[in-house]
């Protein structure tokens, strides 16, 4: 008889084990899920008050039709800068018209002045002709004025109201360019 | 957490094409851009093509005219096709995506494959 009753005990133990270990289950869900749940709460205020104030461009972007364009405070080489730009969801500028053109040089001209920008210009190491970044030609009108002595890469960069080219390795600020985003309204 | 899944590396001959693809899998990451950087032994590594959500296009300067890149945003996927494959063009390629982690520790990032290589050689 005692035999059964401590048998019974151990069970109802092993029993309580389990609902405790269960109890534990669930509160450790609960409050993974109350987690997920403020997070996801913060990213849709996020999305939403940001979908608010959709502005074209993002914030310290300069708007100009349907491009944005970002002029950067750090100087890097060619090559960074075409990363410093992917990182933003941007490629290096690629000028498609002297409007374009005059606007870049105006802008630059009233936030910086004389200084040298990269643009996703460069010259291709076989033909020597000039090539956007995606591969396509520039408009004879936009071509670097001044053919560069060196021996290595070559890059266009503008500096004042001109397009002009330099060895890719040196350092200079550099501009990126985005889609603006359609205003839904 | 988010990985990057690479294939379509491989051997190939002067002159042949591979097409490589990289997927990004998980969450808690806003895609930016994706894109692909090489390393061959004993050099540094170069950004081969990248490829923002918007579809602007940048290539290397060695790659510019031969390789291809493309991209798929809704399977957060890109794709780089290789033709006119050289010698030099032998190195481990690595997948890249530039976002913004969107999850409790926001901010940018930039996320890198294991890498394929790529072998062109007769």
């Known amino acids: 008889k005692l035999l059964q009753v401590s048998t019974i005990a151990m069970q109802q133990q092993e029993k309580l084990i389990q609902q405790e270990r269960a109890l534990l289950n669930f509160t450790e869900w609960k409050r993974s899920c109350a987690l997920q749940m403020k997070y996801c709460q913060a990213f849709m205020q996020n999305s939403l008050s940001s979908a608010h104030n959709s502005s074209p461009c993002p914030n310290n972007w300069i708007q100009n039709r349907e491009s944005c364009y970002y002029v950067s405070e750090i100087w890097s080489i060619w090559h960074t800068s075409q990363e410093n730009c992917l990182k933003e969801g941007s490629t290096l500028l690629q000028i498609e018209s002297k409007e374009e053109m005059d606007f870049i040089t105006g802008s630059l001209r009233k936030i910086k002045g004389s200084y040298d920008y990269w643009v996703g210009l460069s010259q291709d190491g076989h033909s020597g002709r000039w090539l956007w970044q995606d591969g396509s030609s520039p408009s004879p009108g936009l071509l670097p004025a001044e053919r560069s002595q060196s021996a290595n890469q070559v890059c266009g960069y503008v500096k004042s109201n001109s397009l002009l080219s330099s060895n890719c390795s040196t350092w200079k600020y550099f501009i990126c360019e985005k889609y603006a985003l359609r205003s839904s309204v | 957490q988010v990985q990057l899944q690479e294939s379509g590396g491989g051997l190939v001959q002067p002159g042949g094409s591979l097409r490589l693809s990289c997927a990004a899998y998980?969450?808690?990451?806003?895609?930016?851009?994706m894109g692909w950087y090489r390393q061959a032994p004993g050099k540094e590594r170069e950004l081969v093509a990248g490829?923002?959500?918007?579809?602007?296009?940048t290539y290397g300067n060695s790659v510019r005219g031969r390789f291809t890149i493309s991209g798929d945003n809704a399977k957060n996927t890109v794709y780089l096709q290789m033709k006119s494959l050289k010698p030099e063009d032998t190195a481990v390629y690595y997948c890249?995506?530039?976002?913004?982690?969107?999850?409790?520790?926001?901010?940018?990032?930039?996320?890198e494959g294991q890498g394929t290589q790529v072998t062109v050689s007769s």
């Open positions: 890249s995506a530039w976002g913004v982690k969107t999850g409790p520790e926001s901010g940018s990032g930039t996320l």
């Open positions: 998980g969450s808690i990451f806003s895609i930016n851009a």
């Open positions: 490829i923002t959500t918007q579809g602007r296009i």
